[in-house]
Every structure is written in C-alpha cells, then in structure tokens.
C-alpha cells in the first residue's frame, strides 16, 4: 500500500481542516488508514482522524481544531496499521479556504432596487470576520448567457443593484462566495443559491 498523491490540506481558519490524498489502488480509507495530527506545541497531544472514501482510491479527513492562529503548525502522520506511509506538516494560516457565506436573501420590496444580503460565516472574534470580501453570482434560469459576477470589496455582506439591470419578468438565481486577501486564501465554496422572480415597472419611453 502506497500513497500516490500526498495529502494536501486546507483550513477554514476556525475549527476544521480538510486533508485529501490518493492511494495507489482502491482503499477502504476508514478501516485501513489513520491520519494522526498534532499541534507543534509543548503541551499538545496527537489526535486521530478517521478518513472517509473520496472516490475509489481517494481519501478525505476532517481534522478538528479548537481554533487557529497564524503561528500554528501541525505535524501529520499517515498510518496503515503499524506502517507509516507518509509524514508531513501543515500550517493552517498558509492554506485557508474560508467557510461559505450563508442565509443569502433577495429583498425585492425596495422600489426598483434589489437588495441581496447574506451572513458572514465567522463569529466576530475570528480574525477573518473583518477581512472577507465577496463575489455574488447572478444568472438567469432561462438564458445561460445571462450570467454576471459582482465583486463586493467592502466588508458589509450586502449588495444593491438596480432591478432594471436584469431582465424583467423572468426568474433569476444568486449565490455568493468569500475570500480573504490578508491570507491569500482560495475562494470558499458557493453558498446555496436563492431564486426570485425579477419584475419592475418599465419607465415610459420618451419620443
């Protein structure tokens, strides 16, 4: 049994880091493998993560952490029974994938304006809380070409757009994702999408 693709890990910079790797053949990850992880700190102890299958030869493990700070470094040991298959380290702050925003809501009751709001996925005491920026994706269910991205570079989790920038009388969907420049993170996953019917009063044409 050998590791084909070494574990790569990303952290949500809160409580979970996710590590993925591939074995050289079909593997029952949960029965055959264990990933041991330990914070490099005098008084820390090793924790065991039981991996799950992620495709035939792929494994994924969700490492639980109390919290994360920039200085944290973890040692990782991948074991198959008594055999050490791989040894490495992981610094969560250097491999951050933020949590996806939640509670995306489209408020259509503001005259001719669409107000999209969502929730910051981090509590106020987390470092990323004040460092997230967002991308909002809006697309038409009827027209695949009607697909747009709005970059929200301010901290407030909301976006206002004129309803008239979208077509009237058709249904749209929106979703939002986050990233943090400070840690050069990857983008989060997209939030679940939300749907609304776009309708607004066309202004009278002037001749």
């Amino acid at each position: 049994m050998k590791v084909l693709q070494e574990p790569t890990c990303v952290s949500d910079y809160m409580s979970i880091s996710t590590c993925e790797w591939k074995m050289n053949g079909p593997t029952n990850c949960s029965t055959e493998l264990r990933l041991l992880y330990q914070l490099v700190f005098l008084l820390s102890e090793a924790h065991t993560c039981i991996p799950e299958n992620n495709g035939g030869a792929g494994c994924v493990c969700h490492l639980l952490m109390d919290d994360v700070v920039s200085a944290d470094n973890y040692t990782l040991d991948l074991w198959a029974g008594q055999q050490l298959l791989w040894k490495g380290s992981f610094k969560p702050s250097e491999h951050v994938k933020p949590r996806a925003p939640g509670n995306l809501t489209v408020h259509t009751n503001v005259s001719d304006t669409l107000l999209l709001t969502w929730s910051n996925p981090y509590p106020p005491d987390n470092y990323l809380y004040n460092h997230l920026t967002y991308a909002v994706n809006i697309w038409s269910e009827n027209d695949p070409a009607d697909f747009r991205i709005y970059n929200v570079t301010y901290l407030e989790p909301s976006l206002r757009i004129a309803a008239s920038t979208l077509k009237s009388g058709i249904s749209y969907r929106a979703r939002v994702r986050a990233w943090a420049q400070c840690y050069n993170t990857t983008w989060s996953e997209w939030s679940p999408s939300t749907k609304w019917h776009n309708s607004y009063r066309e202004p009278f044409e002037q001749h």
Epitope: F41, L42, L43, S44, E45, D66, V69, S70, A71, D72
Partner: antibody
C-alpha cells in the same frame, strides 16, 4: 463559565509536605493541558509545572524538579501538586491555570507558607 | 535572573499610548510565541495577549502585541486608570521544555 478553585495551602515546616488540589469546572477538563504557577510575596510569577491533557507528558521547573509531582484525575476534573521537601523559598501563592497555547484561565490561588 | 527581560516599571497619563518591551537573551531560541498577562493589584493574573498578537475575547482592542525575533512588545493605547497593574510576558522554551516568564513591569497611570 470556566472556574478553577485551588485548595490545600497552609503553613508547613521546612522539609515537610503538602498536596494542592485544583477543582476545574465549566470546560472539558480532559481535553486541556494544565499548569501550576507560583508567586512569592512581592515577587513576580514563576512557572512550576505542566501536564498534558492525558497526563502522558509532564514538565517541571528546575527549582522544583525531584521534589514536586504534578498529576491529574480526569474523572474527577481535578489537578494536583504534591510538594515534598519544602523549603522557605517555596513560600508563595500557588495558582492553577488552564493551558490553551498560553495560561488562558487562572484560579484565585492558595497560599503556601514554609516556615519553622 | 530571567531569560526574558522587562523594564521594572513604566508610566503614562490617561489617554496616552504606552509600550512595554520583553527581550529574550541572545541565546534564547526564536521558536515559541509570546504571551502577555495582566495582574491587577490583589488579584490573579489574566491572559491579555496570546500567540504574539491575539486577544482573547473580552480583552479590549486597546491592548495589542507584536513580536520581532526573540523580543516582543505590548502596547496599550488610550491608557486608563484601571490599566494600572503588573504586566508579564511569557513564552514556551522548547529547547529546555519549560515555560519562562519575564520579571514583570509595574505600570503606573499618572494623574
């Protein structure tokens, strides 16, 4: 709410022994390393000893090595410090502290006086 | 003699910014993060800063920490009378498997 309550302090003669206890509540005791820190009257803080969450690894300051023993009972949520061969310079308030990277919660301390 | 050196005293007037330094001796290993503790008169110490610059919840953002090599500093802005206390720096010394603490700095708020 995290609470640490030390007990067992008192007056003891040089060469004598004392056992300090620290009762913990408000958090999962078995998941946290713990430590003892002391403060002699009018002096600064001095780290004494620390123990990992399971009790498998233990560390001592040179000044107490061989005389003090730290231990824990995770079923009772209690940390202990057995102090033998006590000296006058061990006179101090002894604080028990929870460890999360640093000493993030402290008890109110118990006074140990070593005097003849 | 502590391997972490702090000035024995510091002072400032209300509203001022005060900085307290904590210097590791030349041979001190540059490995562990620095922590800062506040001890108000007659009370137990309280964690103020951990992992160089992180504040536990409930600690005002007037307190900030930074690290450079084997030294660290604690800054207190908008000084208040209730900040009058002893301040200690500390770090884990991985070379000797111990925790080391500075000698403490007594902060006086004048006026």
């Amino acid at each position: 709410e995290v609470q640490l309550l030390e007990s067992g302090g008192g007056l003891v003669q040089p060469g004598g022994s004392l056992r300090l206890s620290c009762a913990a509540s408000g958090f999962t005791f078995s998941r946290h390393a713990m430590a003892w820190v002391r403060q002699a009257p009018g002096k600064g803080l001095e780290w004494v000893s620390a123990i990992t969450a399971s009790g498998r690894s233990i560390y001592y300051a040179d000044s107490v090595k061989g005389r003090f023993t730290i231990s824990r009972d995770n079923s009772k949520n209690t940390l202990y410090l057995q102090m033998n061969s006590l000296r006058a310079e061990d006179t101090a308030v002894y604080y028990c502290a929870r460890v999360h990277r640093a000493f993030d919660y402290w008890g109110q301390g118990t006074l140990v006086t070593v005097s003849s | 003699q502590s391997v972490l050196t702090q000035p024995p005293s510091a002072s400032g007037t209300p509203g001022q910014r005060v900085t307290i330094s904590c210097s590791g001796s030349p041979l001190f290993p540059d490995s562990g993060s620095f922590n800062w503790y506040q001890q108000l008169p007659g009370t137990a110490p309280k964690l103020l800063i951990y992992a160089d610059s992180h504040r536990p919840s409930g600690v005002p953002d007037r307190f900030s920490g930074s690290k450079s090599g084997t030294s660290a500093s604690l800054a207190i802005s908008g000084l208040r009378s209730e900040d009058e206390a002893d301040y200690y720096c500390g770090t884990w010394d991985y070379s000797l498997n111990r925790y080391v603490l500075g000698g403490g700095t007594k902060l006086t708020v004048l006026g």
